[in-house]
C-alpha cells in the first residue's frame, strides 16, 4: 500500500540479561527526511490524546536534544534510510515490544519490533545430518539466535567433555534478514564414536561457560569382530583338532548373518560363531577369518594363520637357467613342500652325493662343460626326511673348441691358382651349424666347412675360419703366401725435383709396390728400343731429342709387369729461329709484306721482339710482323728474338728488298 512507510528488520531479537542487542533496520519514509524519532517500550495508543503512551527509551527531536539517561540505548540510523538500534546492556525487563515512532514533516509511523530477553544465556541448538556412517565425513552445525557487536561470544565443540581436534568454522549474521552465530564442524566419525556425547558450548569472550546443547552420536557401522583360536598359536600336526570362535564387539544396527572364510574364500555350511576342524590335513593350512554382516555391510575379523605341520614331500629341482652357457653362473633350487620348512638338504649330481652342499640353493659361479648332468635333492625337517624326486637336467653349452684352418693345396700358391681350405674343430655344444671366413670374398663353399678360392688374388695374405653354433670360434689366421709378378710398376722422376731443362742431369726410377718372390730384374725402353737393365735410368746432360715416351719392365720368376708409358718433357729456350717472308723477300712498294719468326721452343714462345738492320726494336710482340704499305726505305735486314720461361733465342738476319713500283719509276 503506497500510504505505508517501508521497514526491514528481524521480526524478533533474542538476548539475555546483561548482554546487548543490536537491531539492524532500514526504512523508507513517505515524504522528506525524518524530523523526530522516539523509541517506546510496550507502546499503547491513547485515543483521547491521539498519542502513544509507554516508556520512552530514546528520543530525538528537531532541536537534537537527547536526555542523558538515554546512553544505554543508541539510535545509529539517519534521516532517510537507516534505523539501526543498539541497547547495551540489555535487561530482562526490556523484553516485550519496541516501538519506533517516526515523524517527518507531514507523515507519522509506528514500527513494532519484538525483543525477547531471558534471565540466563539460552542454549545453542545442535543440528545433525539424518544418518551418520563410520568414516563418512559429516558436518555438525551449532546455531545460536544471537549476535551483538558489543558482546563477543564463542561456540566450542566437545566430545565426551573433551575439546574436539577438528577446526570449526564460526560465522555470524547481523543483517535486516537474520541475526545469529553459527559454528560448523567437519568430522569423520569412527565406529567407536557411536553413543558418544557431543556438546556445543556457548562461552563469553574470556571462555567462561554461558550455556550448552548436547546430542548423542548414532554412528552406523559394520560389525566389529574378534577371533579366538584353540590352540592359541594355531600350529598343529596332521590329525589334530582346531576350534575357532567369533565374537561381536560392536554392531549398529544389529548383525544379521555369520560366515567363515579360508584364504578369502567362503567355507560352505559354516554359519555359526564357532568353527570346529577335526583331524586336520595339511591342505587345511591357511588364513581363516569370520565375517558378520548388518544393514551397513560386512565386517571381518583379523586373520588367523593355521599351520598344519608335515614331513617334506618328494622334492623337485629348479635350475636357473638351463641350458647354461659355459662361464656363466647357475643356481639350483631344491623345492619340497614341508611344514616347518626343511632344515637340511642333500644334493646329488648324476646320482652321486655332492659333498658339503646342505642348503636349499646350490650356486655354481662359473659353469664348465663337466657340470652338465642330472641334479636331484632330498629335504629334511623335524618331522622326517622326504623322498628324492626325479631331478633336473643341466645342459652346458659352449662355443666350438680348438678350431683350425687347414690349406689342402700343395705349396707354394701362385696368383690365379684355385685354393681349397677346410675348417676343423674338436668339440661343440650345440652342434656346429655354419662356418665363417675372413676376409669375406665372393668365394665358393662346395661343402660345409670347406672354402674354394678360384683365381686367388696376390693380396690374399691370410685366411681365418670360424666354426659357429650359437657362437663363433675363430681359428688363428693361416698365411697363403701367394706368389705373384711385380705390381704397380711406374716410372718416377727422382732428379731434378722441378721441371727438366735442356742440359740438366736427369734420373728416372722404376718403382714397384711389391713382388713375391722379391728377386727382380729391370728393363727400360723408349719407342721399343732397350735402354738399360738397372732400376734407374740416368742422363748426364739431357737434350730436347731425349724427350719422348719411356716405359720400364720389372720381372720375377712368376712373370713380368710393364709401367704405363711416361712422357719425358724437356724444357729449352727458343732455338733454330729464322725469319720467313711472305710473299717473298722481294716486294714492290705499296704492297704488304709479312715477316714470320719461326722457332722451336718448349714451352712455346710467349712473345717476340723484332729488330731492324740497326738493331732498333720495332713495336711488335707477336709472331708475325706485317708491313703495309711497304716502302723502299723498309728495305734491309730484319731479325727476331723469341722469349719463353727458360730463356731467349735469336734468329740470323733476313733481308727484305722493296723495289719501286712502275708508277714511281714512271714519275722519275
Amino acid at each position: 500500500d503506497s500510504s505505508k512507510w517501508v521497514f526491514e528488520h528481524p521480526e524478533t531479537l533474542y538476548a539475555w540479561e546483561g548482554a546487548c542487542v543490536w537491531i539492524p533496520c532500514t526504512y523508507r519514509a513517505l515524504d522528506g527526511d525524518l524530523e523526530s524519532f522516539i523509541l517506546f517500550h510496550n507502546p499503547e495508543y491513547n485515543k483521547n490524546t491521539s498519542k502513544f503512551d509507554g516508556t520512552r527509551l530514546y528520543e530525538s527531536t528537531k532541536d537534537g536534544k537527547v536526555p542523558s539517561e538515554q546512553k544505554r540505548v543508541q539510535f545509529l540510523g539517519d534521516k532517510n534510510k537507516n534505523c539501526t538500534l543498539s541497547i547495551h546492556p540489555v535487561h530482562l525487563n526490556d523484553s516485550g515490544q519496541l516501538g519506533l515512532r517516526m515523524e517527518s514533516k507531514t507523515e507519522k509511523w509506528m514500527e513494532r519490533i519484538h525483543l525477547n530477553v531471558s534471565e540466563r544465556p539460552f542454549p545453542p541448538h545442535i543440528q545433525l545430518p539424518p544418518e551418520i556412517q563410520e568414516s563418512q565425513e559429516v558436518t555438525l552445525t551449532c546455531l545460536l539466535n544471537f549476535s551483538c557487536y558489543g558482546y563477543p561470544i564463542q561456540l566450542q565443540w566437545l566430545l565426551e567433555g573433551v575439546p574436539m581436534r577438528q577446526a570449526a568454522v564460526t560465522s555470524t549474521s547481523l543483517t535486516i534478514k537474520s541475526v545469529f552465530t553459527r559454528s560448523e564442524l567437519k568430522f569423520s566419525p569412527q565406529w567407536s564414536h557411536h553413543g558418544k556425547i557431543v556438546t556445543c558450548q556457548l562461552q563469553d569472550a574470556d571462555g567462561k561457560f554461558l550455556s550448552n546443547d548436547t546430542v548423542q552420536l548414532n554412528v552406523k557401522h559394520t560389525p566389529k569382530l574378534e577371533i579366538k583360536v584353540t590352540p592359541s598359536d594355531a600350529i598343529v600336526r596332521e590329525g589334530d583338532s582346531v576350534t575357532m570362535t567369533c565374537e561381536v564387539s560392536s554392531s549398529n544396527p544389529e548383525y544379521t548373518t555369520v560366515s567363515w572364510l579360508k584364504d578369502g574364500t567362503s567355507l560352505k555350511k559354516q554359519n555359526t560363531f564357532t568353527l570346529n576342524l577335526r583331524e586336520v590335513t595339511k591342505d587345511q593350512s591357511g588364513k581363516y577369518c569370520c565375517q558378520v554382516s548388518n544393514d551397513v555391510g560386512p565386517g571381518r575379523s583379523e586373520e588367523v594363520f593355521l599351520q598344519v605341520q608335515y614331513a617334506p614331500e618328494p622334492s623337485t629341482v629348479q635350475i636357473l637357467h638351463s641350458p647354461a652357457v659355459e662361464g656363466s653362473q647357475v643356481e639350483f633350487l631344491c623345492m619340497s613342500l614341508a611344514n616347518p620348512l626343511p632344515t637340511n638338504y642333500t644334493w646329488y649330481h648324476n646320482g652321486k652325493e655332492m659333498q658339503g652342499r646342505t642348503e636349499e640353493k646350490v650356486h655354481i659361479p662359473k659353469i664348465l662343460p663337466w657340470h652338465a648332468g642330472t641334479y636331484s635333492c632330498v629335504a629334511e625337517n623335524i618331522l622326517g626326511t622326504g623322498q628324492r624326486g626325479p631331478g633336473a637336467e643341466l645342459d652346458v653349452q659352449y662355443p666350438p673348441k680348438k678350431v683350425t684352418t687347414v690349406i689342402q693345396n700343395p705349396m707354394p700358391i701362385r696368383e690365379g691358382d684355385t685354393v681349397t681350405l677346410s675348417c676343423n674343430y674338436n668339440s661343440s655344444n650345440p652342434s656346429v651349424t655354419r662356418y665363417e671366413w675372413k676376409p669375406h670374398g665372393a668365394w665358393e663353399e662346395p661343402s660345409l666347412g670347406v672354402l674354394k678360392i678360384q683365381n686367388v688374388g696376390w693380396d690374399n695374405t691370410t685366411i681365418a675360419c670360424a666354426a659357429c653354433n650359437s657362437w663363433c670360434s675363430w681359428a688363428s689366421p693361416v698365411a697363403l703366401n701367394v706368389q705373384y709378378a711385380p705390381r704397380d710398376v711406374r716410372v718416377r722422376k727422382i732428379k731434378p725435383l722441378s721441371e727438366i731443362h735442356s742440359g740438366n742431369s736427369v734420373s728416372l726410377q722404376c718403382d714397384f709396390s711389391s713382388s713375391h718372390p722379391k728377386e727382380v730384374q729391370f728393363f727400360w725402353e723408349k719407342n721399343g728400343r732397350l735402354l738399360g737393365k738397372e732400376s734407374q735410368l740416368n742422363f748426364d746432360s739431357i737434350s730436347p731429342e731425349d724427350a719422348g715416351s719411356y716405359s720400364c719392365w720389372v720381372n720375377n720368376s712368376i712373370g713380368q709387369t710393364a709401367s704405363k708409358a711416361w712422357t719425358l718433357e724437356v724444357l729449352y729456350a727458343p732455338r733454330r729461329l729464322r725469319v720467313s717472308m711472305s710473299p717473298g723477300d722481294q716486294v714492290m712498294e705499296g704492297k704488304s709484306a709479312t715477316l714470320t719468326c719461326e722457332s722451336d721452343a718448349n714451352p712455346p714462345v710467349s712473345h717476340y721482339t723484332w729488330f731492324d738492320w740497326n738493331n732498333q726494336s720495332l713495336p711488335y710482340h707477336s709472331q708475325k710482323l706485317r708491313l703495309e704499305p711497304v716502302k723502299v726505305q723498309h728495305s734491309g735486314a730484319y731479325w727476331c728474338q723469341g722469349t719463353n720461361s727458360v730463356g731467349k733465342g735469336r734468329s740470323p738476319l733476313s733481308t727484305l728488298t722493296v723495289y719501286y713500283s712502275p708508277e714511281t719509276i714512271g714519275r722519275r
Epitope: 731492324d612 740497326n614 704499305p629 723498309h634 734491309g636
Partner: antibody
Framework: QVQLQQSGPGLVKPSQTLSLTCAIS??????????WNWIRQSPSRGLEWLGR?????????DYAVSVKSRITINPDTSKNQFSLQLSSVTPEDTAVYYC?????????WGQGTLVTVSG | DIVMTQTPSSLSASVGDRVTITCRAS??????LNWYQQKPGKAPKLLIY???SLQSGVPSRFSGSGSGTDFTLTISSLQPEDFATYYC?????????FGQGTRLEIK
C-alpha cells in the same frame, strides 16, 4: 715534360676529309723509342685505335683495318708534329679524337678534339 | 684481332673498399697489357703498363697482375677521387685494342 697539342676543325661535312694535327713538345716525332698514335672515342664504339707512325731506321705506319682505305698518318719532322687525314667521312665518324704517345703504353695524350660530321 | 673483355661493366663501392676489375684477352698476349683511368671530359690516364708496372706518379693503392690471357687491376682502399671509368688495352699486336670499360661509382 712531354705535351701534345691537337688542332683542327670540330665540324666536317659528310664525304669530306677530316684533318687533325698533333704538335709535340718535350720529345721528337723521330724518336726511335716512341710511336705516335691516333685514337678516337664515341659512346657507340668506345676507345678505338686508328693507327700510328713511328721512326726506327725508316718511317713506318700501321692502320686499323676498319679505316685502312681512308686513313693517312704523316710525320712532319720540321714542325715536330704528325697529322691525321680521314677521307670520305660519314656521321659514324663523329667522335672525340685523341693523339697519344706510346712508349710503354699510351703515357701522354692530347687534349682531345670533338669532331662532328654533319651536313 | 685480339678481343679484350672487361668484367664487371659497372660496380658500386664505398670509400675504403677493396675493388678488383678483371680483363680477359681472346688469345695470349704475354704481359703486354696496360690499364687506364678516365674521368668525364678528360683524356685517359695510364695507371699500369706491362701488366704489373706502376706508372710514375700513380698512387701505390693501384696494382696489376696476370699474364697470358687473364689480368686484374686492384684498388686496395678506394679514395673519393678513384670513382671513374677504367680501361684495359693490349699492345701485343696490331690492331691495338681496348676493353669496353668498367664504370666504378659510389655506393
Amino acid at each position: 715534360q712531354v705535351q701534345l697539342q691537337q688542332s683542327g676543325p670540330g665540324l666536317v661535312k659528310p664525304s669530306q676529309t677530316l684533318s687533325l694535327t698533333c704538335a709535340i713538345s718535350g720529345d721528337s716525332v723521330s724518336s726511335n723509342s716512341a710511336a705516335w698514335n691516333w685514337i678516337r672515342q664515341s659512346p657507340s664504339r668506345g676507345l678505338e685505335w686508328l693507327g700510328r707512325t713511328y721512326y726506327r731506321s725508316a718511317w713506318y705506319n700501321d692502320y686499323a683495318v676498319s679505316v685502312k682505305s681512308r686513313i693517312t698518318i704523316n710525320p712532319d719532322t720540321s714542325k715536330n708534329q704528325f697529322s691525321l687525314q680521314l677521307s670520305s667521312v660519314t656521321p659514324e665518324d663523329t667522335a672525340v679524337y685523341y693523339c697519344a704517345r706510346d712508349v710503354e703504353g699510351f703515357d701522354y695524350w692530347g687534349q682531345g678534339t670533338l669532331v662532328t660530321v654533319s651536313g | 684481332d685480339i678481343v679484350m673483355t672487361q668484367t664487371p661493366s659497372s660496380l658500386s663501392a664505398s670509400v675504403g673498399d677493396r675493388v678488383t676489375i678483371t680483363c680477359r684477352a681472346s688469345q695470349s698476349i704475354s704481359s703486354y697489357l696496360n690499364w687506364y683511368q678516365q674521368k668525364p671530359g678528360k683524356a685517359p690516364k695510364l695507371l699500369i703498363y706491362a701488366a704489373s708496372s706502376l706508372q710514375s706518379g700513380v698512387p701505390s693503392r693501384f696494382s696489376g697482375s696476370g699474364s697470358g690471357t687473364d689480368f686484374t687491376l686492384t684498388i686496395s682502399s678506394l679514395q673519393p677521387e678513384d670513382f671513374a671509368t677504367y680501361y684495359c688495352q693490349q699492345s701485343y699486336s696490331t690492331p691495338i685494342t681496348f676493353g669496353q670499360g668498367t664504370r666504378l661509382e659510389i655506393k
